[in-house]
């Protein structure tokens, strides 16, 4: 004969665990149903009645199967330096990421708590390491023979042009200036 399927709530066999999408209620001492994502427990189970679930209210969510009595609050609205990459729904929290030109200075479990503008390297300095979603730009002084004449978070130090005859020598923040004879790189 096939084993009889137990309907929640039921007392688990000694040493066994509750099934998928169930939890062991320590007060009722029964395996009871969890609530689906987007819901929360409105009434906990008893020995004879299963969990009663209810939908999360606006601006709250549950992402997992659960038996929490209250849904989690969605995070606050994204700030002006952020972009909402995932909206707040009953099943997921809002995710804010930094807009272009900014990086995440203080991250949270998902998305970013605090964005900061990417550092701009001033003339005479170029980008040694580009910024990422979570790290700032690293600048370095332009080495002899190279220059950067911009204030930029993306420009690297470029080589001076090579002149047949130099009118003005280049430096870290300025390219060389050649006389009218055509320069070479």
């Amino acid at each position: 004969l096939p084993a009889q399927v137990a309907f929640t709530p039921y007392a688990p066999e000694p040493g066994s665990t509750c099934r998928l999408r169930e939890y062991y209620d320590q007060t009722a001492q029964m395996c009871c149903s969890k609530c689906s994502p987007g819901q929360h427990a409105k009434v906990f189970c008893t020995k004879t009645s299963d969990t009663v679930c209810d939908s999360c209210e606006d601006s709250t969510y549950t992402q997992l199967w659960n038996w929490v009595p209250e849904c989690l609050s969605c995070g606050s609205r994204c700030s002006s330096d952020q972009v909402e990459t995932q909206a707040c729904t009953r099943e997921q929290n809002r995710i804010c990421t930094c807009r272009p030109g900014w990086y995440c200075a203080l991250s949270k479990q998902e998305g970013c708590r605090l964005c900061a503008p990417l550092r701009k390297c001033r003339p005479g300095f170029g980008v040694a390491r580009p910024g990422t979603e979570t790290s700032d730009v690293v600048c370095k002084p332009c080495a002899p023979g190279t220059f950067s004449n911009t204030t930029s978070s993306t420009d690297i130090c470029r080589p001076h042009q090579i002149c047949n005859v130099v009118a003005i020598p280049g430096n870290a923040s300025m390219d060389a200036v050649c006389t009218s004879t055509s320069p070479t790189r």
Epitope: Q26, T27, A41, V43, T48, S49
Partner: antibody, heavy 119, light 106 residues
């Protein structure tokens, strides 16, 4: 408006059965998720949970007192009863009944009834 | 059974002070803790449930926090009507009260 009121014998002798009644209004024990529990407080001491009954008649007892406690309800009259067998002087206390929510905390309490067990 | 250790058992504070009471559970209670105010001749009054959810009508001076087995309850800007005893209640596994804290004015 939810209200609960406890009543009891006032005074009784050791070894007798202590009988308490909780009369409530503003909610029904026919309603899903509703429950009523009993809590006591001996004079000068803290609160102690005794027993609880749910809308579906499921019952829970304090393990230390379980053998002496019986909780029951009369849903039609909005009454919950608690009996404590073999009363002792240590059972002298103020007894409270309280409504319990579906997520298991007491949200509204009665003002209590004082019971003295003395010979 | 879960034991709840509440401290301090008594507390003397001045009006306007912030006071904090703690409850430690003998095991993880998954945020299932409530806090009650109890005045003589009255039934206890629910202030907070599920660790930090303020009951409707309760002033925001009252707050709760914690997780696992460690929980705290605070009253900001103490007022004369706050003089009472305070109890925590764990409802993660059956129901157990803390021993209570009697709050007095200096």
């Amino acid at each position: 408006q939810v209200t609960l009121k406890e009543s009891g014998p006032g005074i009784l002798q050791p070894s007798q059965t202590l009988s308490l009644t909780c009369s409530f209004s503003g909610f029904s024990l026919n309603t899903l998720g509703m429950g009523v529990g009993w809590i006591r407080q001996p004079s000068g001491k803290g609160l102690e949970w005794l027993a609880h009954i749910w809308w579906d008649a499921d019952k829970y007892y304090n393990p230390a007192l379980k053998s002496r406690l019986t909780i029951s309800k009369d849903t039609s009259k909005n009454h919950v009863f608690l009996k404590i067998a073999n009363a002792d002087t240590a059972d002298t206390a103020t007894y409270y009944c309280a409504r319990m929510t579906g997520t298991r905390y007491f949200d509204v309490w009665g003002t209590g009834t004082t019971v003295t067990v003395s010979s | 059974d879960i034991q709840m250790t509440q401290s301090p058992s008594s507390l003397s504070a001045s009006l306007g002070d912030k006071v904090t009471i703690t409850c430690k559970a003998s095991q993880n209670i998954n945020k299932f803790i409530a806090w009650y105010q109890h005045k003589p001749g009255e039934g206890p009054r629910l202030l907070i449930h599920y660790t930090s959810t303020l009951q409707p009508g309760i002033p925001s001076r009252f707050s709760g926090s914690g997780s696992g087995s460690d929980y705290s309850f605070s009253i900001n800007n103490l007022e004369p009507e706050d003089i009472a005893s305070y109890y925590c209640l764990q409802y993660g596994v059956l129901w157990t009260f803390g021993g209570g804290t009697k709050l007095e004015i200096k």
